[in-house]
Amino acid sequence: MQKGDQNPQIAAHVISEASSKTTSVLQWAEKGYYTMSNNLVTLENGKQLTVKRQGLYYIYAQVTFCSNREASSQAPFIASLCLKSPGRFERILLRAANTHSSAKPCGQQSIHLGGVFELQPGASVFVNVTDPSQVSHGTGFTSFGLLKL
Amino acid sequence: MQKGDQNPQIAAHVISEASSKTTSVLQWAEKGYYTMSNNLVTLENGKQLTVKRQGLYYIYAQVTFCSNREASSQAPFIASLCLKSPGRFERILLRAANTHSSAKPCGQQSIHLGGVFELQPGASVFVNVTDPSQVSHGTGFTSFGLLKL
Amino acid sequence: MQKGDQNPQIAAHVISEASSKTTSVLQWAEKGYYTMSNNLVTLENGKQLTVKRQGLYYIYAQVTFCSNREASSQAPFIASLCLKSPGRFERILLRAANTHSSAKPCGQQSIHLGGVFELQPGASVFVNVTDPSQVSHGTGFTSFGLLKL
């Protein structure tokens, strides 16, 4: 996309990491077949992708989860792509929802989110889910990334 | 994206093709409203997209399938985006899973996969599914593509 | 992506809008955290994204809906990404289908569509669904966009 020193390619693809934390923010790692083009995008605290340059970015996340209707709350499983810009409150960019499966012990489902957004220097994006304990971390099932247009 | 002779755009979008083969690798065709930007990306043997240039690519696949819980194995329907680099074994880049529907005769569901990956010259990507006989080949339901950043 | 006056970035991301119209074409708005890079892409009549320049575009849509098997027709919920080129009939680029949920009063599900397509100057893309009354318009649930390669 962006060629030359003035316009280096900026892209990232990180892999889900199981976490003992009770937070609803998913954890990610630079492992397996990951992508981190350069230091103009970084994975911070294993939870957010932070960009150094302003611009339009295509941001995406995929979350696979395994849940059961009887064992889960009545509310659906929701994955949210969220933005934290410097000096601003967090906001939701994208959400997807899937009702829990009736399959036993649980039924797997995959969610994909993606969209084009303007990011400011220092902006961070992260992924939130209603129940992180239901997320599938087998390789390739859950990932998160972006690319600068 | 990449302008001029030095940086031609490289992109492909191919359409699913029903196959009598028993292989779990999906078959594709340059038909309908397909995209094949130039010979720097090619569809080989109707099953894999092969690139000539090293670089970062956004690769995606969409698979629609129709299955029934009683008529299928207990395992979910899984679609995998796979990579074969020259001189290396195949590996899975992305996977998505959906539990079979209880709808009769079968319930349709759609899976979308997408991510940014570094590809080497001669690398091929392909899509694998647990049961190709369940895949829907109606217009627009199942497709596969990439674009070079 | 495309730098300089000759190659401005062209991208859009619009947000779903509830509509009293009975049409199956979804309505969109430039509201919330939307993107409209410049006047080389426009949202027309709140229903279609129209481009002024020929080229390859990655076009995507996400639709979240809430439906119930008993209250819906037997046919699945289908979302279609459609193209209207000047002087041509409309055509379907991408479709995704999800069987209705058995959850009461309704079960939420999300669909993601995306692919690379060649668009002509004046071409418009829009999103069609089988039942627009089932679409979820909460923040981030349903969106539509494109980016020029």
């Epitope: 630079e30 397996g32 077949y33 990951y34 992508t35 981190m36 087998g138 390789t139 390739g140 | 292989t23 779990s24 690798v25 796979c82 020259p86 001189g87 290396r88 074994f89 195949e90 590996r91 899975i92 996977r95 570094e118 694998n128 | -």
Partner: antibody, heavy 123, light 113 residues
């Protein structure tokens, strides 16, 4: 516990073929790379080729191309290596070795090995 | 093919002392995409199959004692046994896992002095 159990020793005449089997247990056979590595008496290790059963297409070292065939039977969790046109210098211990699974990578590193099968080629 | 060259061919070290084995590849085995070195180390005792010790140049396989460590990048790699034990007497091989054919070094025999 992952185990790779190979077939027994073989004595073969020059020009003939040998087929060695490798039965896997304790893992999801179809998603792991199975390679074949040989070791001539008192010599080092030599990779011959390998296969991931779910993909079914074998990779071969150029040196053995056309003379070796590697297959896998998912139903019995067994991999096979057939070497044809045998000559005396093919006398070696033949090992099957498992790489990481296709989703854990790298499949090109071998974490479990069979006990080895001695193939003697002699007239 | 990538040629792997180990040095020395054999090594005699006192119990409790450090043993160092070098391995040089004829071309880089570093993947630019994720900075991973596709290099592994194996231990082979007489009459046994090889055993994986280290992969990705420096990652210890589970169950391998921490006296074994790997280092290096690109074309030059080292296996270190920080404090040699009697059970470490074996032949050690490096292997490039970068591209087919996956090739091994000629081996280094480690004995007790």
């Amino acid at each position: 516990q992952v185990q790779l159990v190979q077939s027994g020793a073989e004595v073969k005449k020059p020009g003939s073929s040998v087929k060695v089997s490798c039965k896997a247990s304790g893992g999801t056979f179809s998603s792991y790379a199975i390679s074949w590595v040989r070791q001539a008496p008192g010599q080092g290790l030599e990779w011959m080729g390998g296969i991931i059963p779910i993909f079914g297409t074998a990779n071969y070292a150029q040196k053995f191309q056309g003379r070796v065939t590697i297959t896998a039977d998912e139903s019995t969790s067994t991999a096979y290596m057939e070497l044809s046109s045998l000559r005396s210098e093919d006398t070696a211990v033949y090992y099957c070795a498992r790489g990481a699974s296709v989703w854990d990578g790298p499949a090109e590193v071998f974490d479990y090995w069979g006990q080895g099968t001695l193939v003697t080629v002699s007239s | 093919d990538i040629v792997m060259t180990q040095s020395p061919d054999s090594l005699a070290v006192s119990l409790g002392e450090r043993a160092t084995i070098n391995c040089k590849s004829s071309q880089s085995v570093l993947a630019s995409s994720n900075n991973e070195n596709f290099l592994a180390w194996y231990q082979q005792k007489p009459g046994q199959p090889p055993k994986l010790l280290i992969y990705s140049a420096s990652t210890r396989e589970s169950g391998v004692p921490d006296r074994f460590s790997g280092s290096g990048s690109g074309t030059d790699f080292t296996l270190t046994i920080s404090s040699l034990q009697a059970e470490d007497v074996a032949v050690y091989y490096c292997q490039q896992a970068y591209t087919t054919p996956f090739t091994f070094g000629q081996g280094t025999k480690v004995e007790i002095k």
